[in-house]
């Protein structure tokens, strides 16, 4: 029995964090702490069901290097959510993200990932 998976590309700015070179190295504490918080944040946002996780997370410098741009791919079981709801639910969580994770989020962009897409599937 094969279960379909839908993927969405998501990009956003974290305006209260400074980008530095350690965000290009997955072994650094800064990278791992930010990845940890972002991963948990998405679990909280989409915990209504169908959310399978995220992959291909990348950190980039924002405009002028004064912020962090996060780019990642979200995976959901097929048919459980659409691109509009992905963006709406994420935007609704911005206040919580600021209070719980100290992340000031702006410039959210969500798009469908065209099929086929090969995501990194981690161990269980």
């Amino acid at each position: 029995l094969s279960t379909g998976v839908s993927f969405f590309f998501l990009s956003f700015h974290i305006s209260n964090l400074q980008f530095n070179s350690s965000l290009e190295d997955p072994s650094t504490d800064y990278y791992q702490e930010l990845q940890r918080d972002i991963s948990e944040m998405f679990l909280q946002i989409y915990k209504q069901g169908g959310f399978l996780g995220l992959s291909n997370i990348k950190f980039r410098p924002g405009g002028g290097g004064g912020s962090v741009v996060v780019q990642l791919t979200l995976a959901f079981r097929e048919g459980t959510i659409n691109v509009h709801d992905v963006e709406t639910q994420f935007n609704q969580y911005k206040t919580e993200a600021a209070s719980r994770y100290n992340l000031t989020i702006s410039d959210v962009s969500v798009s469908d990932v065209p099929f086929p897409f090969s995501a990194q599937s981690g161990a269980g």
Partner: antibody
Framework: QVQLVQSGGGLVQPGGSLRLSCAAS????????MHWVRQAPGKGLEWVSG????????GYADSVKGRFTISRDNAKNSLYLQMNSLRAEDTALYYC??????????????????WGQGTTATISS | SSELTQDPAVSVALGQTVRITCQGD??????ASWYQQKPGQAPVLVIY???SRPSGIPDRFSGSNSGSTASLTITGAQAEDEADYYC????????????FGGGTKLTVL
């Protein structure tokens, strides 16, 4: 309500086999990774095995690798643990547990939020 | 593989605050989750992630993380909090593996 109901424990001789089952209800079973965790008498918790939502990723503790096999049937909302070549040190209370996440796609691990009641496997001659 | 190290036993006076700690390399990469286990019962998740509580867990339970150490704090410990507490995370060196600490027996005096 959300629950996991276990069955299949028992007494078996060393070298024998047992199959444990875990029936899930009250949640969308195929959204989540699942685990088996055991607890020897008077000891702490030991992770045994885990399986991702779609069985695409599976892991085992070194102590059971090559002897135990985890599987799931999403159509039946069921999780299984086939235990072969059993040893006295496998004697324990075995729990099935639901992962908070799916176990794949940047497989961040959050923890286990629902546990079965436990089933005892006793390996003795 | 990694290990998670916990103090075997901790005690606290009724109504006081107690901190249970867990140390291990994997905690630099992964948050700890914390479980309460009372005699003859299955474990119960009390804290996961940065400091998240499942529904039904009292707010006197909280979690924190710093480097390779995770802590579970019970603020105003109650008699019913007497139990074994286990920390848990993914193994930093084996991505498909999950590890538990040895457990801490909490006694409420």
């Amino acid at each position: 309500q959300v629950q996991l109901v276990q069955s299949g424990g028992g007494l078996v001789q060393p070298g024998g086999s047992l199959r444990l089952s875990c029936a899930a209800s009250g949640f969308t079973f195929d959204d989540y990774a699942m685990h088996w965790v055991r607890q020897a008498p008077g000891k702490g918790l030991e992770w045994v095995s885990g399986i991702s939502w779609n069985s695409g990723s599976i892991g085992y503790a070194d102590s059971v690798k090559g002897r135990f096999t985890i599987s799931r049937d999403n159509a039946k909302n069921s999780l299984y643990l086939q235990m072969n070549s059993l040893r006295a040190e496998d004697t324990a209370l075995y729990y099935c547990a639901k992962d908070i996440g799916s176990g794949s796609y940047y497989n961040y691990y959050y923890g286990m939020d629902v546990w079965g009641q436990g089933t005892t496997a006793t390996i003795s001659s | 593989s990694s290990e998670l190290t916990q103090d075997p036993a901790v005690s606290v006076a009724l109504g006081q605050t107690v901190r249970i700690t867990c140390q291990g390399d994997s905690l630099r990469s992964y948050y700890a989750s914390w479980y309460q286990q009372k005699p003859g019962q299955a474990p119960v998740l009390v804290i996961y992630g940065k400091n998240s509580r499942p529904s039904g867990i009292p707010d006197r339970f909280s979690g924190s993380n710093s480097g390779s150490t995770a802590s579970l704090t019970i603020t105003g410990a109650q008699a019913e909090d007497e139990a074994d507490y286990y920390c848990n995370s993914r193994d930093r060196y084996g991505n498909s593996l999950v590890i538990f600490g040895g457990g801490t027996k909490l006694t409420v005096l």
